[in-house]
């Protein structure tokens, strides 16, 4: 499944991998590698959604490694320390500062390949990851603001007289409900302490010609729809059919 | 101790070239550290110019990367800077002077040993 | 490159009084920035790099401070042989630039 498009004009690149899980980069093609500095002298800040559980790769600017003193990455994860992974290439030293997280690693050796991974992206992955690349000609920077997006259970029911329930369960970030046809709704969010969201939106429908209502759940792992027939029958439950 | 010492000639004419030589006692450039050149021009202001590493590689700062070279004669624990076409903003005190390169610390390019300097004069 | 901007270019004190050195960098450099200490007739000498780590042999009275863009150098209460020329040197990226100097002269 393709993970949704970031802010900017890059396309995420998505694939499957031997462990069924996809991975998600924003790297440059090697071809794409630039000797002209200039190009990429403005720290470049990129907002990247991420779906949990999948892989995710974060690349350095296009430089080429031969032109390397040090590359650093700094990952700063809410209500952590900031953890610093460094290479320094003179003496092929490797240096971690206040890193405990095994699942952030380089994907590579770094003297072959100066990008990092994440492998099985977790809700405390969201924050903010730099790469820093010291050269002769100066420092260059590539920054992610990295958002893990957690998919919502949704469940649609009918509660009692013409009024029925769409929950979107655990989401990441807020699920937006919306229903065809537009009844009297309520919309209420639950925060919970992982960062996620639960959106419960209850409508009533006093037009007795709607019989059929359906409930659409947008959110940027993709949308969903669920539909429910309203019964008249006071208290009577029915379950949701989705298409 | 590690102790570094410059020498070179003195006056040079415009347009030519000169070789500078730090050689080094103490410790040999071949197990470690970065071995830079500085000058100080008239006025105090003072630029670094580039280093060689005790593997043979350089870094040379980019505004004079296309007039200069840093190479080394190992076996006499010696290396030199070398600059072409120059001009009377050459004139400057040159130093060479070692790297700190502690392993727990990576922006470590900070000098904790310099030599004395040598003067030179670009002059017709 | 970085440009360094360092303040006064010269510096009046008599022995025994507390100086301060300015140093501000054109860009962030975290916190590192390194001080010199330039005599006449002698090689020049590092007293504090990585902004406030004081290098072996240093004495306690000199000391560092600042982040990011704006580094001072503090010398409480001054002794004859510290009147000297004192320069800042960024060492967070190539080229490496030094501050202008700043003269310490007897008044």
């Known amino acids: 499944e393709g993970a949704a498009q970031p802010n900017n004009s890059l396309m995420l690149q998505t694939s499957k991998e031997n462990h069924a899980l996809a991975s998600s980069s924003l790297c440059m093609d090697e071809k794409q590698i630039t000797q002209n500095y200039s190009k990429v002298l403005a720290e470049v800040n990129t907002s990247w959604p991420v779906k949990m559980a999948t892989n995710a790769v974060l690349c350095c600017p296009p430089i080429a490694l031969r032109n390397l003193i040090i590359i650093t990455w700094e990952i700063i994860l809410r209500g952590q320390p900031s953890c610093t992974k460094a290479y320094k290439k003179e003496t092929n030293e490797t240096k971690e500062t206040n890193c405990t997280d095994e699942r952030i690693t380089w994907v590579s050796r770094p003297d072959q390949n100066s990008d990092l991974q994440i492998r099985t992206v977790a809700i405390t992955h969201d924050g903010y990851y730099r790469c820093i690349m010291v050269t002769p000609d100066g420092n260059f920077h590539r920054g992610y603001h990295l958002q893990v997006l957690v998919t919502p259970e949704v469940t649609l029911f009918q509660n009692r007289n013409r009024t029925a329930v769409c929950k979107a369960v655990a989401g990441k970030p807020a699920a937006h409900i919306s229903w065809i046809p537009e009844g009297d709704c309520a919309t209420k969010q639950e925060y919970w302490s992982n960062g996620t969201v639960t959106v419960k939106s209850t409508c009533h429908w006093e037009v007795h010609n709607v019989s059929t209502v359906t409930c659409h759940v947008s959110h940027l792992t993709g949308n969903k729809s669920l539909y429910i027939e309203l019964l008249p029958v006071p208290g009577a439950k029915k379950s949701a059919k989705l298409y | 101790e590690i102790q570094l010492q410059e020498s070179g000639p003195g006056l040079v004419k415009p347009s030519q070239s000169f070789s500078l030589t730090c050689s080094v006692t103490?410790?040999?450039?071949?197990?470690?550290?970065?071995w830079s050149w500085i000058r100080k021009f008239p006025g105090n202001r003072m630029e670094w110019m580039g280093y060689?590493?005790?593997?043979?590689?350089?870094v040379y700062n980019p505004s004079l990367r296309s007039r200069f070279s840093i190479t080394r004669d190992t076996s006499k624990n010696q290396f030199f800077l070398q600059l072409n076409s120059v001009a009377s903003e050459d004139t400057a005190t040159y130093y060479c002077?070692?790297?700190?390169?502690?392993?727990?610390?990576?922006?470590?390019?900070?000098?904790?040993?310099w030599g004395p300097g040598t003067m030179v004069t670009v002059s017709s | 490159d970085v440009q360094m901007t360092q303040s006064p270019s010269y510096l009046a004190a008599s022995p025994g009084e507390s100086v301060s050195i300015s140093c501000k960098a054109g860009?962030?450099?975290?916190?590192?920035l390194a001080w010199y200490q330039a005599k006449p007739g002698k090689t020049n000498k590092v007293l504090i790099h990585?902004?406030?780590t004081l290098q072996s042999g240093t004495p306690s009275r000199f000391s560092g401070s600042g982040f990011g863009t704006d580094f001072t150098l503090t010398i409480r209460s001054l002794e004859p042989e510290d009147f000297a020329v004192y320069y800042c040197?960024?060492?967070?990226?190539?080229?490496?630039?030094f501050g202008s100097g700043t003269k310490l002269e007897i008044k």
């Open positions: 002077a070692k790297f700190e390169a502690s392993n727990t610390y990576l922006y470590d390019w900070y000098f904790d040993f």
């Open positions: 040197q960024q060492h967070n990226e190539f080229p490496l630039t």
């Open positions: 060689i590493n005790y593997s043979g590689s350089t």
């Open positions: 860009k962030n450099i975290n916190t590192n």
């Open positions: 990585s902004g406030s």
């Open positions: 103490g410790y040999t450039i071949t197990s470690g550290y970065d």
